[in-house]
Interface confidence: medium
């Protein structure tokens, strides 16, 4: 058993049929010694008396809010949550496996630049009685500070018969050093509590591996005289790290016909302009990627040819 | 050339070669995310790799103030990786394919280090840890780790030279 926060405790249980469970001793937080009784949740049934209560925790029915009273007055509470371990593996019932970039990916994180700020998100089909708490650090043995905001519900989607909820959190490294080569990964830890079930999820990454620039901005076409060619120009996204002479991007320019089956013409360039042939009903798209480190491409910025 | 005394390197040449190094490092090990190498007990293998750290003066301001600290750090790293790529980690079994970019990568590391430090000048170099994995699978894993680490190192080096070429070239 360990304390998650004040008056909230997590009991770690091996979860298999007829498991013996864990013996837990609860102590009433009071100077009083006599006349103390214990109850569980909203029940008025007295579970025991005395300053301490010993219970055998085997299943969710044994978890919940234990309260000690004296003469009708509440003295203190202890909330017990369960963390299940099945076949040596901690349960992951609360969050959905996103399977990208690999199986057992519950948390996904992205950064728009090298400033030390990143966003992580996760999915669940649970809509109520759900809380999340997020902590993060750079490195684990001698951790350096990362500040995370509150996890918030950022999207709801219908997937077949199920509703899916996306939660996200924004974090900022306290003393980021954008020009350095990271040697210690960022660690993100999410505590998830659904009713009386506790689970924790972790992700470990370098900022450089989760970089995904915003799409190029101000995408414009300039027709060239007496030609089917156009000059496409664009700019670095506002959110990309500066100076751009140091944090450079590379770009992919694509000409795509109306039909997905039509051949795509692609040009790669380090410049912020390119000359391409604009076919009727086609569109021109540009995306960006870090020039020197192959992290994710941005989403496409697009304009129609006409 | 970045001589220890403090003259300027051939920024544009260094820029071109460092960008080529980035391309080669990624073609040598393109599998991003398919193998989480940090789960494989990193510490004993890549802890000794020289990293370009916050105080090494490789940020735009540091380069403007005095690029020598940063260039020395990059030179150290280039020599380190050049020796690793020439060691039995890469020359031993399982043999690299004849068209593997590792050979080119090795030569380019040497080329850039020589651009930074011509013959007859010596900057301190870092000791290469004695990594001699006994099993071929260990060697393969170590190659991946070294290449992943090299990708991060050459990215920073390439940024330094790109910025230098754009803002510090005579």
């Amino acid at each position: 058993i360990w304390e998650l926060k004040k008056d909230v405790y997590v009991v770690e249980l091996d979860w298999y049929p007829d498991a013996p469970g864990e013996m837990v001793v609860l102590t009433c937080d009071t100077p009083e010694e006599d006349g103390i009784t214990w109850t569980l949740d909203q029940s008025s049934e007295v579970l025991g008396s005395g300053k301490t209560l010993t219970i055998q925790v085997k299943e969710f029915g044994d978890a919940g809010q234990y309260t000690c009273h004296k003469g009708g007055e509440v003295l203190s509470h202890s909330l017990l949550l369960l963390h299940k371990k099945e076949d040596g593996i901690w349960s992951t019932d609360i969050l959905k496996d996103q399977k990208e970039p690999k199986n057992k990916t519950f948390l996904r994180c992205e950064a728009k630049n090298y400033s030390g700020r990143f966003t992580c998100w996760w999915l669940t089909t649970i809509s109520t009685d759900l809380t999340f708490s997020v902590k993060s650090s750079r490195g684990s043995s001698d951790p350096q500070g990362v500040t995370c905001g509150a996890a918030t519900l950022s999207a709801e989607r219908v997937r077949g018969d199920n509703k899916e909820y996306e939660y996200s959190v924004e974090c900022q490294e306290d003393s980021a050093c954008p020009a350095a080569e990271e040697s210690l990964p960022i660690e993100v830890m999410v505590d998830a509590v659904h009713k009386l079930k506790y689970e924790n999820y972790t992700s470990s990454f370098f900022i450089r591996d989760i970089i995904k620039p915003d799409p190029p901005k101000n995408l414009q076409l300039k027709p060239l005289k007496n030609s089917r060619q156009v000059e496409v120009s664009w700019e670095y996204p506002d959110t990309w790290s500066t100076p751009h002479s140091y944090f450079s991007l590379t770009f992919c320019v694509q000409v795509q016909g109306k039909s997905k089956r039509e051949k795509k013409d692609r040009v790669f360039t380090d410049k912020t302009s390119a000359t391409v042939i604009c076919r009727k009903n086609a569109s021109i798209s540009v995306r960006a990627q870090d020039r020197y480190y192959s992290s994710s491409w941005s989403e496409w910025a697009s304009v129609p040819c006409s | 050339r970045a001589v220890p005394g403090g003259s300027s390197p051939a920024w544009t040449q260094c820029q071109q070669l460092s960008q080529k190094l980035c391309t080669l490092a990624w073609s040598a090990h393109p599998l991003v995310g398919h193998m989480d190498l940090r789960e494989e007990g990193d510490e004993e293998t890549t802890n000794d790799v020289p990293h370009i750290q916050c105080g090494d003066g490789c940020d735009p301001q540091g380069l403007r103030d005095n690029s020598q600290f940063c260039l020395q750090r990059i030179h150290q790293g280039l020599i380190f990786y050049e020796k690793l790529l020439g060691s039995d980690i890469f020359t031993g079994e399982p043999s690299l394919l004849p068209d593997s970019p590792v050979g080119q990568l090795h030569a380019s590391l040497l080329g850039l280090s020589q651009l930074l430090q011509p013959e007859g000048h010596h900057w301190e170099t870092q000791q290469i840890p004695s990594l001699s994995p006994s099993q071929p699978w260990q060697r393969l894993l170590l190659r991946f780790k070294i290449l992943r680490s090299l990708q991060a190192f050459v990215a920073v080096a390439a940024r330094v030279f790109a910025h230098g070429a754009a803002t510090l070239s005579p």
């Epitope: 400033s115 959190v169 900022q172 306290d174 003393s175 954008p178 959110t239 500066t242 | 916050c54 301001q61």
Partner: antibody, heavy 122, light 107 residues
Framework: EVQLLESGGGLVQPGGSLRLSCAAS????????MDWVRQAPGKGLEWVSS????????FYADSVKGRFTISRDNSKNTLYLQMNSLRAEDTAVYYC???????????????WGQGTMVTVSS | DIQMTQSPSSLSASVGDRVTITCRAS??????LAWYQQKPGKVPKLLIY???TVQSGVPSRFSGSGSGTDFTLTISSLQPEDVATYYC?????????FGQGTKVEIK
């Protein structure tokens, strides 16, 4: 023209509450981190609170933690500061300020509002 | 938390004089330092960021230098319109702390 305009200041009793607003115009508000900075009469500048561009990250000075809440509505281009449990020492001109986006210039406040006066007195 | 200490707290100089204000951080902050000018009854204005980069529109007589813990703001030739209080501010990490200010007057 890039502009920040604060409102909502006034006289309030100790223990009372006040909500300050800062209306932004002339720039893409949703792309910038924003701050509140205050200046007590005849005194220096004191940073109060920061909020990230999306609103997902907030930071507070120790002197206001637990009493003040910073928030923003990007659809209205407005920054807010909810001040509860006000004390006499919170009396100051409250400025809203924009963070410069360029990382190397970090969190220098490049645009300031004209300020709104908050007086806490019985 | 890192403390920022400015000196002097006030100074009086003649028009055309070279004026130097220093700011010391209790721990190293690299070049994450800004200088602001606040004229009497007016709003603070950003002069310098990154310890030495002059904000656009700021007269060239203003310059900044330093890195780590010791920083300097220099006015190469003091003008009557430079009468103001000058603040340094560190921004390597929260809290963004200001120095206590230096009041500059004309003799």
């Amino acid at each position: 023209e890039v502009q920040l305009l604060e409102s909502g200041g006034g006289l309030v009793q100790p223990g009372g509450s006040l909500r300050l607003s800062c209306a932004a115009s002339g720039f893409t508000f949703s792309k910038y981190d924003m701050d509140w900075v205050r200046q007590a009469p005849g005194k220096g500048l004191e940073w109060v609170s920061s909020i990230s561009s999306s609103g997902g990250l907030t930071f507070y000075a120790d002197s206001v933690k637990g009493r003040f809440t910073i928030s923003r509505d990007n659809s209205k281009n407005t920054l807010y500061l909810q001040m509860n449990s006000l004390r006499a020492e919170d009396t100051a001109v409250y400025y809203c300020a924009r963070h410069d986006y360029d990382f190397w210039s970090g969190h220098a406040f490049d645009i300031w509002g004209q300020g709104t006066m908050v007086t806490v007195s019985s | 938390d890192i403390q920022m200490t400015q000196s002097p707290s006030s100074l009086s100089a003649s028009v055309g004089d070279r004026v130097t204000i220093t700011c010391r951080a209790s721990q190293g902050i690299s070049n994450y330092l800004a200088w602001y000018q606040q004229k009497p009854g007016k709003v603070p204005k950003l002069l310098i960021y990154g310890a030495s980069t002059v904000q656009s529109g700021v007269p060239s007589r203003f310059s900044g230098s330093g890195s780590g813990t010791d920083f300097t703001l220099t006015i190469s030739s003091l003008q009557p319109e430079d009468v103001a209080t000058y603040y340094c501010q560190k921004y390597n990490r929260v809290p963004w702390t200001f120095g206590q200010g230096t009041k500059v007057e004309i003799k």
